[in-house]
């Protein structure tokens, strides 16, 4: 057979679908690898061919499109399962070809089982809601294209195992679930089950997402440096270890990059010759506000180091702040036998 542009196994598109539910899987060639769509390819005389390799097998085999009730079918650039079975798990390949052109890509498909509370190995999308922010909605994801607009499905929403109905804070509204005022207690996994008829059969689509209630932009402030501050003086003798923590509080801000860094005499620690190490730790509150601590450490401080300027900087989408640490050399306590005796006029 002639050469084929093989894009290999596209593990970025690890597709997970539930057992015993319909699944429609678009050939990734047109979405991510080629610069033209299926219609263009089709009208240019290219044919889309599907085949697969079962889990724990090496043998590529054609997909059986002659199963009872057309359980597996192809429509344009979509491979349909109505419904999936556990042993459909494997690597699927779509190949676009004619006599002069060939391009193919494989992708893994995993059919997973869920329990009575919709737990499964499925990776869940996370939807962030702002705390006490007014009405916010989540929408039942990835159900487009499963049924025509003329079909009116029934949608049931669950939190964990439990149907959501008549609840004062969370209201099911068809494909949407509305949170009137999001609270920490609304954190959890929410599932929509979409039920629709097709050719005398009833199908269910299960979609679960994680809701995480986060700090509201209404309450967001620029970074707050708790340490260093004016109340603490880092007084050291040469040869001692100097440890200065920079502790910064960041309000939660969607897609904001929080940064903390030290400067020593206006330079980044990497750009100066002294032996300095910086260790960072990060903690989060329940609403994903962040506290970052960077500890600047000089193992054996010199009197020169104790004259330098140590400044902690912090930046978020809300602004930039800086605070200098108060560092000074400890004045040695007078030694009684010499200094004090001299003071008393001893000779």
């Amino acid at each position: 057979s002639e050469r084929c542009d093989d894009w290999g196994l596209d593990t970025m598109r690890q597709i997970q679908v539930f057992e015993d539910e319909p699944a429609r899987i678009k050939c990734p060639l047109f979405e991510h690898f080629l610069k033209f769509n299926y219609s263009t390819a089709h009208s240019a005389g290219l044919t889309l061919i599907w085949y697969w390799t079962r889990q724990d097998r090496d043998l590529e085999e054609p997909i059986n499109f002659r199963l009872p009730e057309n359980r597996i079918s192809k429509e344009k650039d979509v491979l349909w399962f109505r419904p999936t079975l556990l042993n459909d798990t494997g690597n699927y390949t779509c190949m676009l070809r004619n006599t002069t052109y060939c391009s193919k890509v494989a992708f893994p498909l995993e059919v997973v089982q869920k329990d009575s509370c919709f737990n499964s190995p499925m990776k869940l999308p996370v939807h962030k809601l702002y705390i006490e922010y007014g009405i916010q909605r989540i929408t039942c994801p990835n159900v487009d294209g499963y049924f025509p607009s003329s079909v009116k499905p029934t949608i049931t929403w669950y939190m964990g195992c439990y149907k959501i109905q008549n609840f004062n804070n969370v209201i099911p509204e068809g494909m949407n679930l509305s949170f009137l005022i999001a609270l920490i207690s609304n954190n959890g996994n929410y599932t929509c089950v979409v039920t629709y008829p097709e050719n005398g059969r009833t199908f269910h689509l299960t979609r679960t997402l994680t809701v995480k209630v986060v700090g509201s932009p209404k309450n967001a402030v620029p970074p707050v440096i708790h340490s260093p501050n004016d109340h603490v003086v880092y007084e050291k003798e040469p040869g001692e270890e100097l440890l200065i923590p920079c502790t910064v509080y960041f309000s939660f801000l969607m897609d904001s990059r929080n940064e903390v860094w030290w400067t020593i005499d206006g330079k980044k620690p990497d750009d100066i010759t002294i032996d300095v190490t910086i260790n960072e730790s990060i903690s989060h509150s329940r609403t994903e506000d962040e506290t970052r601590t960077q500890i600047l450490s000089i193992k054996k401080v010199t009197s020169e180091d104790l004259k330098r300027s140590y400044v902690c900087h912090a930046r978020s989408a809300k602004g930039e702040v800086a605070k200098a640490a108060k560092v000074k050399q400890k004045v040695p306590a007078p030694r009684y036998t010499v200094e004090l005796a001299c003071g008393f006029g001893a000779t």
Partner: antibody
Framework: QVQLVQSGAEVKKPGSSVKVSCKAS????????ISWVRQAPGQGLEWMGG????????NYAQKFQGRVTITADESTSTAYMELSSLRSEDTAVYYC????????????WGQGTLVTVSS | EIVLTQSPATLSLSPGERATLSCRAS??????LAWYQQKPGQAPRLLIY???NRATGIPARFSGSGSGTDFTLTISSLEPEDFAVYYC?????????FGQGTKVEIK
């Protein structure tokens, strides 16, 4: 630590109803669900149903549908199980047990309430 | 409803011996299975969830394995306090169901 404390033993006549309470402490009540499991003398365990403390919606085993009502009062962190139309075969120890909203295993249990149905 | 069948009904062993308890489901429950221990006059106690995960505070001598329809609870070396009745429970389908129990008694 988490504790589930159930109401005391009951003796009931056939045809009547019984309501057993389960008070939770040592955790956020609304973050969990409460299931009810019963055990007839010398027998195994039987799941009756469960309720979401935050939503107040319940799931029931088909066998008990229409005869059992499970409720929850978030203000007092208490769940209730009411079983109606009692018959002698309902004589059992009734347990409440806590689980996560999406949890299928019961991680903390009450001490049990013996309900005796006898004429 | 899914039926869970436990075997044997009774297991007579001495302290220090290994106990192997079986639970078989009438259809696949994936790994959505838990094990409980119950002593006379007490409420059940969760030992294992997700077929193989030890619950908080459960000693390492308890282990669970299996997936699909066949599951095993193993107690590597029986302690005097391990003599009790053990139940498996599935959460794959409603209603949640329990096995009839295996009694581990002192020989």
């Amino acid at each position: 630590q988490v504790q589930l404390v159930q109401s005391g033993a009951e003796v009931k006549k056939p045809g009547s109803s019984v309501k057993v309470s389960c008070k939770a402490s040592g955790g956020t009540f609304s973050s969990y669900a409460i299931s009810w499991v019963r055990q007839a003398p010398g027998q195994g365990l039987e799941w009756m149903g469960g309720i979401s403390a935050i939503f107040g919606t319940a799931n029931y085993a088909q066998k008990f549908q229409g005869r059992v009502t499970i409720t929850a009062d978030e203000s007092t962190s208490t769940a209730y199980m009411e079983l109606s139309s009692l018959r002698s075969e309902d004589t059992a120890v009734y347990y409440c047990a806590r689980h996560l909203h999406n949890g299928i295993h019961l991680d903390y249990w009450g001490q049990g309430t013996l309900v005796t149905v006898s004429s | 409803e899914i039926v869970l069948t436990q075997s044997p009904a009774t297991l007579s062993l001495s302290p220090g011996e290994r106990a192997t308890l079986s639970c078989r489901a009438s259809q696949s429950v994936s790994n959505f299975l838990a094990w409980y221990q119950q002593k006379p006059g007490q409420a059940p106690r969760l030992l294992i969830y997700g077929a193989s995960n030890r619950a908080t505070g459960i000693p390492a001598r308890f282990s669970g394995s299996g997936s699909g329809t066949d599951f095993t609870l193993t107690i590597s070396s029986l302690e005097p306090e391990d003599f009790a009745v053990y139940y498996c429970q599935q959460g794959k389908h409603w209603p949640w169901t329990f096995g009839q129990g295996t009694k581990v008694e002192i020989k």
